[in-house]
Each structure stands twice: as structure tokens, then as C-alpha cells.
Amino acid sequence: EDELQVIQPEKSVSVAAGESATLRCAMTSLIPVGPIMWFRGAGAGRELIYNQKEGHFPRVTTVSELTKRNNLDFSISISNITPADAGTYYCVKFRKGSPDDVEFKSGAGTELSVRAKPS
């Protein structure tokens, strides 16, 4: 069985301020089981953008229907983009653990740049 891969197909995405940004991510397998999360930045200071398991993320919507039992698409859309949202976004698969899930594999990242709002 091939090991799960996290695919972020776009290296970069450019969005005008005020618009929505779609960040694409797909898994190649449902196994190992565990949630996915999106982060801005890497390392200890990374910012959680979306957690499949829990939390309220009012600006984030999932592109696909995550309640489908065979879903492998974990793309997200972030609304009302501002310059402060610029950065590199990582889609990260976690392996279930008790008490804490363990990071399993990260996508290569997608750099979001924000253009000035057209006048």
C-alpha cells in the first residue's frame, strides 16, 4: 500500500484584497486515520488556519464536502483577504493519537500573495 501523500498543486496563488483565496490540497489515501489542519507559516510559531476536528473558523470554508466518507479533498477558501493574510500556507495530515494527534505529513506549501484592491 502506497504511503499517503499530501498534494498542494499550486506553489503560489495571488488574490486581490477583499476577494477570497482558494488553497488546494488533496490526500492520496484515507489511511492513516487522523485529521487535517491548515497552517500559515512553519515551525513553532505557525498559525492555525483550520482544524478539521474542532474549532470555529468564520472566514474559512471547505471547498469539498468533508462529511463524505470517501473525501480526499481538503481544499479551503479564505474570505475577505487582506495584506495581513499573505504568507505560505501548509496543509498538514495528522495521524490519530491518544492523547494527542501526531503530525504525519505536510504538503509543500502554497504562497499566498495579496494584490492591492483595484480602484
Partner: antibody, heavy 118, light 106 residues
């Protein structure tokens, strides 16, 4: 508070068809997958069927596949289970349950009793 | 199918552990309490170890490999019930339950 209220249970004859309903309140129904779980008299819990939040994808246990249809009307906050060709083995209390992100269950209804008897 | 003991017993205040095995590493587990046949089950634990906010803290869950464990620390008389483990398998898209464990508080 999350509330799930089943209805439609009845005494029916073998071979007949029945539709169960589950009305949900206290949460955004259209955001959650839902399932039906049943319990035959003196037996344990048995998962019957599940449906994705939009209703586009459905899933069935082998015991009901081909003669049951799960559906939902998100505008009415209602989940349905239509069962045909009923047999005595379908006699059970039928519960609707809300699914968690990983397809387990966090809330259950009180159940509705289906009795198949000639 | 998931395997759990048919019955366990304990004195008030003791700690009870109920195990559930057979789901494999591609499963998540939940624990459901049913106080009488035909009454609504109550979710004690989902996602191996997540306890809903309205469930007393004496109930806890854990999982290691393909075995899940429900622990009741300081069991009380009102905990007499049947406890079902349930699993979801990502390889089959199917939910399964154990046959139930009857807890008797002596």
C-alpha cells in the same frame, strides 16, 4: 440543545414498506452527516445507514442494502429512512444519530419502534 | 466485529476498565451508554478519547493500536448500564458496534 426526534414507527406486515423520519433542532442540520442505528429486542446496536451533510452520498449496512433508502431535506431539518420488503428481522427500535467529524456519533434520538409481524 | 467483555462488576468507588478490540488501526472508537433496553444511547466518548461537555469526568477513553478502553474512575450506582463500543472503519466506510458490556455495581 441538540434534539433529535424520530417518528413513523408502526406495526407492519412482512413485505410492506415504511418511512421513518427524524426531525433535528438545536444545531445547523445541513452541516452534519447523519445516521440511522437500530436495536432489535434483546440485541445490541446495529448501524443501518448514513448520509453526508448535503445528501449527495449515502451508505448502507449489508443487511439493508438494496431495500432501504436514506435521504434528507435540509430545508426541513429532517432525516428519512425508507425501508421496503420488511421482514421480522427488521423489528427494532430505530434511532437517528448525529455524526462527528470522523463518523462516530455524538447525539442520539429517543428512537421509534418498528414491529414487523403477520 | 468489535469484541468486548459480556459483563463486568465493581463496588462503588472502584475503577472499572472495559476494553474493545478488533477495529484495526484504521478505526476510531466511541463509547455509548444505554441504561435500559430501547432507551436512547448516550455518547460518553467519541474519537477514542473525546468526552462531550455534559459527561462526568469520571468517564475517560483511550486507544492503543487496535484496542480501545473505557475507564470509569470511582464508579457509582447510577453507572449500572450496558456499555457499547462503536467503531468507524475508513477502509470499509462502515460503522460497527460491540455486543455490549453489562456493568453491575455491587
Amino acid at each position: 440543545d441538540v434534539q433529535l426526534v424520530e417518528s413513523g414507527g408502526a406495526v407492519v406486515r412482512p413485505g410492506e414498506t415504511l418511512r421513518l423520519s427524524c426531525t433535528a433542532s438545536g444545531f445547523t442540520f445541513s452541516s452534519y452527516a447523519m445516521s440511522w442505528v437500530r436495536q432489535a429486542p434483546g440485541k445490541g446496536l446495529e448501524w443501518v445507514s448514513g448520509i453526508s451533510a448535503s445528501g449527495s452520498d449515502t451508505y448502507y449496512a449489508d443487511s439493508v442494502k438494496g431495500r432501504s433508502t436514506i435521504s434528507r431535506d435540509n430545508s426541513k431539518n429532517t432525516l428519512y429512512l425508507r425501508m421496503s420488503s420488511l421482514t421480522a428481522e427488521d423489528t427494532a427500535v430505530y434511532y437517528c444519530a448525529r455524526e462527528t467529524w470522523n463518523h462516530l456519533f455524538d447525539y442520539w434520538g429517543l428512537g421509534t419502534l418498528v414491529t414487523v409481524s403477520s | 466485529a468489535l469484541t468486548q467483555p459480556a459483563s463486568v462488576s465493581a463496588n462503588p468507588g472502584e475503577t472499572v476498565k472495559i476494553t474493545c478490540s478488533g477495529g484495526g488501526t484504521s478505526s476510531y472508537y466511541g463509547w455509548y451508554q444505554q441504561k435500559s433496553p430501547g432507551s436512547a444511547p448516550v455518547t460518553l466518548i467519541h474519537s477514542d478519547d473525546k468526552r462531550p461537555s455534559d459527561i462526568p469526568s469520571r468517564f475517560s477513553g483511550s486507544a492503543s493500536g487496535s484496542t480501545a478502553t473505557l475507564t470509569i474512575t470511582g464508579v457509582q450506582v447510577e453507572d449500572e448500564a450496558v456499555y457499547y463500543c462503536g467503531g468507524y472503519d475508513y477502509t470499509t466506510y462502515v460503522n460497527t458496534f460491540g455486543a455490549g458490556t453489562t456493568l453491575t455495581v455491587l
